[in-house]
Interface confidence: medium
Amino acid sequence: AAQPNNSLMLQTSKENHALASSSLCMDEKQITQNYSKVLAEVNTSWPVKMATNAVLCCPPIALRNLIIITWEIILRGQPSCTKAYRKETNETKETNCTDERITWVSRPDQNSDLQIRPVAITHDGYYRCIMVTPDGNFHRGYHLQVLVTPEVTLFQNRNRTAVCKAVAGKPAAQISWIPEGDCATKQEYWSNGTVTVKSTCHWEVHNVSTVTCHVSHLTGNKSLYIELLPVPGAKKSAKL
């Protein structure tokens, strides 16, 4: 059917959510003075969506047993940043920390957690809390992986050929098709760590009516649909 501006809106547009928060913190009930008997060091891989808020937690040690808390932050291409708090003198110290979005959640004598408000693509890296206590040192590390939702488009660029693009996602999205066609997929890597995936498919079978591009990504999946129009050179675009 005739389409204004030759364009088709195919599915709901990219979701707009209020800034979400995520945390791997334990609650007070899980805090134990016998933590040393359980685990001395924990490292967690943590995928977090860009533009959300994240809270990173120290080991569940009661603050009264604390001597020093140190957050060590290693981001790609930057010198190591440390944020330290010494309980005895109630003083905090920062070294090489320039990103104002990474802060203590509140006063470190009340809460040792670190917050990132909001998470940016540059916050990919390793975050480690080191708690010095009379019973020894306890660590909790986070390999923070910032996830970026790709912008997805689908259009027909030639007779019975469709192109599906997942632009600037992190990590790279995966693209599959229903029904399967004769497909070629390319990846383009950007300096900020995002990846654009482009899949071009051709369907020789003439009874294929609509094709579905299914984009799988850690931030969520999307399916787009387009009708194969028998018009050489016709370009129907559909941006999510």
């Epitope: 059917a1 005739a2 009874n207």
Partner: antibody
Framework: EVQLQQSGAEFVRPGASVRLSCTTS????????IHWVKQRPEQGLEWIGR????????KYAPKFQDKATITADTSSNTAYLQLNSLTSEDTAVYYC???????????????WGQGTSVTVSS | DVQMIQSPSSLSASLGDKVTMTCQAS????LNWFQQKPGKAPKLLIY???NLEDGVPPRFSGSGYGTDFTLTISSLEDEDMATYFC?????????FGGGTKLEIK
């Protein structure tokens, strides 16, 4: 408000032809596709075919290729289904429905006519 | 043509029950679900396998991928008594399943 208004019930003799109409309002017929669907008494749904009213292009299910002809008149926002060489097998309710071209349900049959009953009997 | 097998062909359930029905295709497809009440035209419930059409109660949900699809009603209500059809729109000719007739016990 989007509506598809179909013509009234038809009683026809075997071998005759009939033309059913589907007049739309609330949208421009030329922007969308119109499909026709057959439902025999107490049976399932069968896709007959569709038309792109903007250019008259049609697609038919093979079993209806020689039975049905779909046309459209954009000036009156009306689509038609002509059925020829009628037999008792053609006794059914026939629905028109649109395939929306302009938003997320473009490929779905989101609005339907009320149906036209066709009875073929001698 | 793509064959669409719906099962069961009929089912009886009580109010408040969770109800599921399936549609199996002979090819990988995308599909829509419709509800039809006696003497009425079909009504679109779900498009693109899992997307709820505007105005459809959230107790309805669709799932599946490829060739196997499910329509679920999380808590059956009186007004859900109807016949449910699936439709594939990936290949021409478009084809419907044979329907699942849902009755209230």
């Amino acid at each position: 408000e989007v509506q598809l208004q179909q013509s009234g019930a038809e009683f026809v003799r075997p071998g005759a032809s009939v033309r059913l109409s589907c007049t739309t309002s609330g949208f421009y017929i030329k922007d969308d596709y119109i499909h026709w669907v057959k439902q025999r008494p107490e049976q399932g749904l069968e896709w007959i075919g569709r038309i792109d009213p903007a250019n008259g292009n049609t697609k038919y299910a093979p079993k209806f290729q020689d039975k049905a002809t779909i046309t459209a008149d954009t000036s009156s926002n009306t689509a038609y289904l002509q059925l020829n060489s009628l037999t008792s097998e053609d006794t059914a309710v026939y629905y028109c429905t649109r395939q929306l071209g302009l938003r997320r349900t473009w490929y779905a049959m989101d609005y339907w006519g009320q149906g036209t009953s066709v009875t073929v009997s001698s | 043509d793509v064959q669409m097998i719906q099962s069961p062909s009929s089912l009886s359930a009580s109010l408040g029950d969770k109800v599921t029905m399936t549609c199996q295709a002979s090819h990988t497809i995308n599909l829509n679900w419709f509800q039809q009440k006696p003497g009425k035209a079909p009504k679109l419930l779900i498009y693109g396998t899992s997307n709820l059409e505007d105005g459809v109660p959230p107790r309805f949900s669709g799932s599946g991928y490829g060739t196997d699809f499910t329509l679920t009603i999380s808590s059956l209500e009186d007004e859900d008594m109807a016949t449910y059809f699936c439709l594939q729109h990936t290949y021409l000719p478009w084809t419907f399943g044979g329907g699942t007739k849902l009755e209230i016990k």
